[in-house]
């Protein structure tokens, strides 16, 4: 049997025998377009495709629609994998989404959604989530039902304001909602009472800007 040389996600990479954390090249079926993604092969059984990471403020997340579409940053550090890739991937089979969070006091928490997918670009990459469990709040900090994605140059939120400009970063803003993991990165002791920080309300409350975030996906049948 010929060895598979292209992988659609980190679960396929893992199942092929590559069980070390790191950056891997992924390709969607029937596509030649490649993306570089970080694969977490250790957490919760491995096979996780990292679609977002914040850790040190080294990457500017106040980006355009096109940049959020194709992805930006450094897969080994802070980055956004890209809405188009994630939309296509999550519409081919069922995926779970795990969001891992760190605060400045050394605490960690997570939210796990048992079904996650993004609509197409024509539908503004609207987020769809179902089945929340985890330690980062009993209520979803991503507004339900899911909202369209907004960026500084694409105002698709439900606010009389422009949430992406007010809060910074691209996100599935409501008006503006209980979360924004792509907000401004604030260092320790400057991370409270922030109107535009990295927010996950149902874990840390209002105005608290987080130290670290990771959004990762994996097939539900992994």
């Amino acid at each position: 049997k010929e060895e598979q040389i292209s992988f659609r996600d980190c679960a396929e990479v893992f199942k092929s025998g590559h069980t070390t954390n790191g950056v891997y090249t992924l390709t969607l079926p029937n596509s030649t377009e490649e993306v570089k993604a970080y694969c977490d092969m250790e957490a919760g059984g491995g096979g996780w495709t990292i679609i977002q990471r914040r850790e040190d403020g080294s990457v500017d997340f106040q980006r355009t629609w096109k940049e959020y579409k194709v992805g930006f940053g450094n897969p080994s550090g802070e980055y956004w994998l890209g809405n188009e890739f994630v939309s296509q991937l999550t519409n081919q089979q069922r995926y779970v989404l795990k969001i891992h969070l760190k605060d400045w006091e050394g605490n960690e928490a997570y939210s796990l959604y048992e079904h996650f997918y993004l609509s197409s670009e024509e539908l503004n990459y609207r987020i769809h989530l179902k089945g929340l469990t985890g330690t980062a709040g009993k209520i979803s900090s991503i507004s339900q039902p899911g909202n369209d994605f907004s960026t500084k140059d694409a105002d698709n939120d439900k606010c009389i304001c422009k949430c992406s400009q007010m809060l910074t970063g691209g996100w599935w803003f409501d008006a503006c909602g209980p979360s924004n993991l792509n907000g401004m990165y604030y260092p320790q002791r400057q991370n409270t009472n922030k109107f535009n920080g990295i927010k996950w309300y149902y874990w840390k409350g209002s105005g608290y800007s987080l130290k670290g975030t990771t959004m990762m996906i994996r097939p539900a049948d992994f």
């Epitope: 439900k158 009389i160 007010m166 009472n193 920080g197 209002s206």
Partner: nanobody, 129 residues
Framework: EVQLVESGGGLVQAGGSLRLSCAAS????????IGWFRQAPGKEREGVSC????????YYADSVKGRFTISSDNDKNTVYLQMNSLKPEDTAVYYC??????????????????????WGQGTQVTVSS
Amino acid sequence: EVQLVESGGGLVQAGGSLRLSCAASGFTLDDYAIGWFRQAPGKEREGVSCIRDSDGSTYYADSVKGRFTISSDNDKNTVYLQMNSLKPEDTAVYYCAAVPAGRLRFGEQWYPLYEYDAWGQGTQVTVSS
């Protein structure tokens, strides 16, 4: 740096009055709405009143309508909550909080709790019977 500092709390007999102050720094009241919230032991934090200077709007919870009055002094960048005819059930820690005035859903007048991103430390109000 955004800061909110409450003052004016204390112990008062039922039927008495108190005036709470919320001094804001790091932003101007013109661009923000200021809300007063309270939290009694073992209970959820609840909205009491809110003021939006940009259009002069005010909001009151049903439980305090006719008894509490919210106002602002832009020169002092301070919001006040005048509390009259106090009842024992008004006993709580009172907090003020700020939200950008424009962070409003189409067709709505006021803001969910999670939109208030800047909070004070609170001031204790105790109403004895």
